[in-house]
């Protein structure tokens, strides 16, 4: 039978007795940088191509047994993963593979950076489809090693690493720390994560998306034929590097902007439990699990939005964080979080000729998160507009004037260290969608957004004493662009865009003791674009 | 994922002294700063990757490169240029004593400088 | 559920040989290393020998090196010890013990362990 | 002789807080190589108590606590129980011996 991890990626229409879903990755090349492999082994031979580069360190110990037939471990099950021919994601997949890691498992920072630009000048030398680089290890935070992965992310590579096996912090660790690379976490058969020994997967913000990593079934070193389970991050960012290059053979033009929206927009959401990962993590890390997409053919009349978050700003005072999205992808709308509740908001700014999103700490808080959320928008014409505290009772309002300019975000920034204490606005009137309202202590942000065949509309949910969480969804065909609360007291925490579902958490009164009776109501902007689905049904 | 200004848990070092007689100051008002890993078990002191600016060419690294390699000479230390980064970042990687840290850093070109550590199979 | 259980000890004579196996079930056996700790009767922990997840790294504690070889079957979920040349202070019960196998990134905690088998040398 | 030394016995009255130590040296605590303990409770295996240095797995009450600092770790045990009463051994990697190395055991006794 069809081993779980296959089916758990394998979309419905494709499950069968075995897997087989169309198109193998055949137009696509997978360059893994790992130990070395055995490439006559039947799952993987004439798939994968062993280059001559190897730069590894010696092995440790004197006093250490070394078997050199054993070295070809870890390697040889991930090219099994990728491309096995039994066992495999994308069978059709071609592969190259590099020695950056020594027997014992073990590489440098300087090695792989090598072992990167090899393949930098490989591709300039013979260029060729689509490439996949899988980087199935990890270190300590690396600024060299995230930056070479940057440069050859803009030249148009693809890379995919292990989001770490140290139950830590995804952020704390390379190349799974760069923002240009897919960095995936590990999850089991019962879709939860992998405990490995006392620790396991990574998680966090750092982390794109999850796979299946424990008890992986794939090609052993031990023999021409034999097979063998293994367990880690390493084998979860093989199944991402296989779906992604079926979704590169298929669509063969995808930027890495686009491959990353598409497999978080086709994963499983919300199936792990988020009670394994630490408390203060939970909010950061995607609940999502990679699958295969249900066709063949792009998904490109779908509106992509993927929310991102800023690191921690830190306690101080007037200490901001910034939230960035990736250069082929619109900034739609930006929020913030504090667990505290003690922020001062957030504003869309200009930085470097793209807008980012900035949320600012308030007195005594214990710091604040900025939320991104960042959509792919061909021919998009964004800006901002500003409108400075109103000082008045009905709140300060902003709306987008430009003729075809349609609302995607509000974000609100005050100065005030506790909204609180200010009698809150009253909710907007019905009728105004291309308007922000906030309190009128704050200044209040527009996003606007010209671009063929968008069209958005404003849908709220409110309740009327704050209760911990209020969410509203956007309906199928719809994209969460805009993520907001109103109003903007102390009671809230702040909003976030989950998938396609506003999230507004607020302190439970309950536990505060407040007898506020005021409402605390979600604020969702959904979108979708009439052109990006006529364009591809012109193309079918 | 991690922003470049975040606050990642590595030491950085901006190390500073009174100017080389025999280099050249780097551009006013930047400072080259050392970083290294934050797990004292993966890091690999004595092997470096000087990292460049942006826009340096293949001549001017193997050039800076050449340079340290003479101011270290004179004051009685030996290094060994592994290997000459282009193609992605311009740079190169050394083996030399931590010594002389201070004295790569104020190179003309240096933006920053990494000591080498671990990456592991997961 | 993860398990270990070990078996072949007993008594033996001095210079004379046994074989200890552990078989592990409930877990994915071929990512852990796998390691023996034996304890002399009355006394402390002693760790006595190493063996990574594929085989490819080993190591022996001093008291046993050129005596004693750890192996594996991943595919029969089984580690092993060889112990040749047994002494006297060879008597213990040896307990098998696993931990995820970081490739040296980090040493893990033995967090699963069998519950011992006894090996006697006497004459 | 071990590698990492511990106090041969410890006593405390029930309720009572007692701590353990563990002294290692620059190859091994002092390296930056985890501690982990291990509680033997008589005629049984060792359970795993606390991992890296200060993590308690599932199951093991709240009552028992890891640290580490420089070539040394302690473990201790507040509000001692009857039950608490067994064998304590620490455990790190050693780099110049290539692997791993446990404490000398230390016998706690609850009093009374």
């Known amino acids: 039978s069809i081993p779980w991890n296959l089916e758990r990626i394998t979309p419905p229409r494709y499950r069968a007795d075995e897997y087989q879903p169309p198109d193998g990755g055949s137009l696509v090349e997978v360059y893994l940088l790992d130990t070395s492999i055995q490439s006559d082994h039947r799952e993987i031979e004439g798939r994968v191509m062993v280059t001559d580069f190897e730069n590894v360190p010696e092995e440790d110990g004197t006093r250490f047994h070394r078997q050199a037939s054993k070295c070809d471990s870890h390697g040889t099950h991930l090219a099994g993963v990728v491309s096995g021919r039994d066992a495999g994601v994308a069978k059709g997949a071609s592969m190259r593979s590099l020695r950056v890691l020594n027997c014992q498992g073990k590489g440098t920072v300087s090695g792989t950076l090598i072992g990167l630009e090899f393949i930098r000048k490989s591709q300039l030398v013979q260029p060729v489809g689509p490439l996949v680089v899988l980087l199935p290890l990890a270190g300590g935070y690396s600024r060299v090693l995230n930056a070479a992965c940057q440069r050859l992310a803009r030249a148009g590579v693809v890379l995919v690493t292990a989001a770490g096996n140290f139950r830590d912090d995804a952020c704390l660790y390379s190349p799974a720390s760069a923002p240009e690379v897919i960095t995936v976490g590990a999850t089991n058969a019962q879709d939860q994560p992998v405990t490995l020994g006392t620790l396991g997967t990574n998680f966090g913000r750092c982390v794109d998306l999850f796979a299946p990593g424990e008890d992986i079934i794939g090609a052993s070193s031990d023999c021409s034929t034999c097979f063998v389970s293994q367990s880690g991050t390493s084998q979860a960012a093989a199944h991402v590097a296989g779906i992604a290059a079926m979704m590169l053979s298929a669509e063969p033009e995808l930027t890495l902007a686009e491959l990353r929206q598409r497999l978080i927009h086709f994963s499983a959401k919300d199936v792990i439990n988020e009670a394994w990962f630490p408390e203060d993590q939970r909010v950061l890390t995607p609940n999502l699990v990679a699958a295969l997409p249900p066709s063949t053919h792009g998904a490109g009349w779908q509106l992509f939005c993927r929310t991102v978050w800023s690191a921690h700003s830190g306690p101080t005072r007037m200490a901001t964080a910034i939230a960035r999205c990736a250069p082929d992808e619109e900034l739609l709308s930006c929020s913030s979080f504090s667990r505290s509740g003690k922020r001062r908001g957030e504003r869309m700014e200009a930085q470097g000729g793209k807008l980012v999103c900035r949320a600012h700490n308030a007195f005594g808080g214990e710091g604040v998160y900025a939320i991104a959320r960042c959509c792919l928008l061909p021919q998009a014409n964004c800006s901002v507009h500003t409108a400075p505290p109103a000082e008045a009772s009905m709140g300060t309002r902003v709306h987008c004037h430009q003729q075809g300019h349609v609302l995607t975000g509000c974000s609100s920034h005050w100065e005030v260290e506790d909204l609180g204490t200010h009698k809150p606005p009253v909710l907007r009137p019905r009728g105004q969608p291309n308007q922000c309202v906030g309190h009128r202590e704050a200044s209040i942000h527009a996003s606007c957004c010209h671009a063929p065949g968008l069209e958005c509309k404003v849908k709220e949910h409110g309740i009327p004493a704050p209760q911990g969480q209020v969410t509203v969804a956007c309906e199928e065909g719809w994209t969460l662009t805009g993520c907001s609360a109103l109003p903007g007291t102390s009671h809230v925490l702040g909003a976030y865009a989950v998938d396609n579902t506003c999230v507004v958490r607020s302190r439970d009164v309950s536990t505060t003791g407040s007898t506020s009776e005021e409402a605390v109501t979600a604020v969702a902007i959904c979108c979708r674009s009439r052109h990006l689905a006529q364009a591809s049904q012109e193309l079918q | 994922q991690e922003d470049e200004d975040g606050d990642y848990e590595e030491l950085v070092l901006a190390l500073r002294s009174e100017e080389d007689g025999l280099a050249e100051a780097p551009e006013h008002g930047t400072t080259a700063t050392f970083h290294r890993c934050a797990k004292d078990p993966w890091r690999l002191p004595g092997t470096y990757v000087v990292v460049l600016k942006e826009e340096t060419h293949l001549s001017q690294s193997e050039r800076t490169a050449r340079r340290l390699q003479a101011q270290a000479a004179r004051r009685g230390y030996l290094t060994k240029i592994l290997h000459v980064f282009h193609g992605l970042l311009p740079g190169f990687l050394v083996k030399m004593s931590g010594d002389l840290l201070e004295l790569a850093l104020k190179l003309p070109h240096v933006d920053y400088i990494e000591e080498d550590s671990s990456v592991f199979a997961q | 559920e993860v398990q270990l259980v070990e078996s072949g000890g007993g008594l033996v004579k001095p210079g004379g040989s046994l074989r200890l196996s552990c078989a592990a079930s409930?877990?994915?056996?071929?990512?852990?290393?796998m390691n023996w700790v034996r304890q002399a009767p009355g006394k402390g922990l002693e760790w006595v020998s190493s063996i990574s997840s594929s085989s490819s790294y080993i190591s022996y504690a001093d008291s046993v090196k050129g005596r004693f070889t750890i192996s594996r079957d991943n595919a029969k979920n089984s580690l092993y010890l060889q112990m040749n040349s047994l002494r006297a202070e060879d008597t213990a019960v040896y307990f098998c013990a696993r931990d995820y196998d970081f490739h040296s990134a980090h040493y893990d905690a033995f967090d699963v362990w069998g519950q011992g088998t006894m090996v006697t040398v006497s004459s | 002789e071990s590698v990492l030394t511990q106090p041969p016995s410890v006593s405390g009255a029930p309720g009572q807080r007692v701590t353990i130590s563990c002294t290692g040296s620059?190859?091994?605590?002092?390296?930056?190589?985890?501690v982990h303990w291990y509680q033997q409770l008589p005629g049984t295996a060792p359970k795993l108590l606390i991992s890296?240095?200060?993590n308690r797995p599932s199951g093991v009450p709240d009552r028992f606590s890891g640290s580490k600092s420089g070539t040394s770790a302690s473990l201790a045990i507040t509000g001692l129980q009857a039950e608490d009463e067994a064998d304590y051994y620490c455990q790190s990697y050693d780099s110049s011996l290539s692997g791993s190395v446990f404490g000398g055991g230390t016998k706690l006794t609850v009093l009374g």
């Open positions: 409930g877990f994915t056996h071929s990512s852990y290393s």
């Open positions: 620059s190859s091994n605590i002092g390296a930056g190589y985890d």
């Open positions: 890296g240095n200060s």
